[in-house]
């Protein structure tokens, strides 16, 4: 049942809370059976995914499944929002779905949000 | 070879919360893409998804039982858990597990047998 | 929610014979990402439910190529070319694309 096509794991409706000022890697997991595809970010605005260009991207590479690395170095307020990876292969373009960054300023933040109110604001965003 | 299979109470009382395991084979929980969920079907009547565990422990639930729902696995001894708290006797029905598989994102390829509920005072 | 209906209620159909089930829902399937989590499952009697497709189109491992699923954004159709004993029971479409996941309310094979 296993098939080679290209799989992007970044789950529907999935995000990530974080803080501006911190280091942080976006992930994408990528299945490929050959060769490996090109990948690339990009970031949401509106319905139009803009492509990152000239930001520090890298590979890890584990057991049975590669991952195409995002660096944030560090997070600013602005990376706020909803991104994309996306995989060249074979001439077809496979998109993943959207994951989101919430960015926490801590010059405005007291306390980060609950698991609860990230879930909430995710539903509001989606529905 | 892929198997599911679903266990629970049988009977339960109003009130009651209802516990059900789901024990599985021929997948690992712990391997992307892979996840679980939780369905249900009211005797003579359709489906109703419940819940989702993914691999890597996210989960998603119905909004309209997800205050009384809860679902969790452990996946070293390839069991995944549902519990519904103060059950009714419109909770009475079939719950089956069945296995989510990846293609860009979750399709049920392989259902349990079932396990029958019947709350009743 | 997404509901998702489907039609005819009940198919009764001698066996040679095609059949057809359709199956509309009240949003476009079509997700961002360009796929439409759109899948069918049968439900023979008193059995539990087997995957037939997913994504529209493609049939599950061990599925007869008699079966094919069809359509786009609100609009699905599964079609059987020609109708054996095995397959009666109950067809059921249901969406992936949205939360909660959602089922049709089943269309009922009958052999005539």
């Known amino acids: 049942k296993e098939s080679c096509d290209v799989q992007l794991y970044i789950k529907r409706q999935s995000y990530h809370s974080i803080f501006a000022g911190d280091p942080f890697k976006l992930e994408c997991p990528v299945k490929y059976c050959a060769h490996r595809p090109q990948v690339t970010w990009c970031k949401l605005n509106g319905t139009t995914c803009v492509k990152l260009e000239g930001r520090h991207t890298s590979w890890k590479q584990e057991k049975n499944l590669s991952f195409f690395i995002l660096h944030f170095e560090p997070v600013l307020p602005s990376d706020n929002g909803s991104y994309r990876c996306s995989a060249n292969f074979l001439s077809a373009i496979i998109e993943s779905h959207s994951t989101t960054l919430y960015v926490t300023d801590v010059k405005s933040a007291s306390e980060r949000p609950s698991k609860d109110e990230m879930a909430s604001r995710l539903w509001l965003l989606y529905s | 070879q892929v198997t599911l299979k679903e266990s629970g109470p049988g009977i339960l009382q109003p009130s009651q919360t209802l516990s059900l395991t789901c024990s599985f084979s021929?997948?690992?929980?712990?391997?992307?893409?892979?996840?679980v969920s939780w369905i249900r079907q009211p005797s003579g009547k359709g489906l109703e998804w419940l819940a989702h565990i993914y691999w890597d422990d996210d989960k998603r639930f119905n909004p309209s039982l997800k205050s009384r729902l809860s679902i969790s696995k452990d996946t070293s001894n390839n069991q995944v858990f549902l519990k519904i708290t103060t059950v009714d006797t419109a909770d009475t029905a079939t719950y089956y597990c069945?296995?989510?598989?990846?293609?860009?994102?979750?399709?049920?390829?392989?259902w349990g047998q079932g396990t029958t509920l019947t709350v009743s005072s | 929610d997404v509901v998702m209906t489907q039609s005819p209620l009940t198919l009764s159909v001698t066996i040679g014979q095609p059949a057809s089930i359709s199956c509309k829902s009240t949003q476009s399937l079509l997700d961002s990402d360009g796929k439409t989590y759109l899948n069918w499952l049968l439900q023979r009697p008193g059995q539990s439910p087997k995957s037939l497709i997913y994504l529209v189109s493609k049939l599950d491992s061990g599925v007869p190529d008699r079966f094919t699923g069809s359509g786009s954004g609100t609009d699905f159709t599964l079609k059987i070319s020609r109708v054996e004993a095995e397959d009666l029971g109950v067809y059921y479409c249901?969406?992936?694309?949205?939360?909660?996941?959602?089922f049709g309310g089943g269309t009922k094979l009958e052999i005539k």
């Open positions: 249901w969406q992936g694309t949205h939360f909660p996941w959602t």
């Open positions: 021929g997948f690992s929980l712990s391997t992307f893409g892979m996840g």
């Open positions: 069945a296995r989510g598989n990846w293609d860009g994102e979750t399709y049920f390829d392989y």
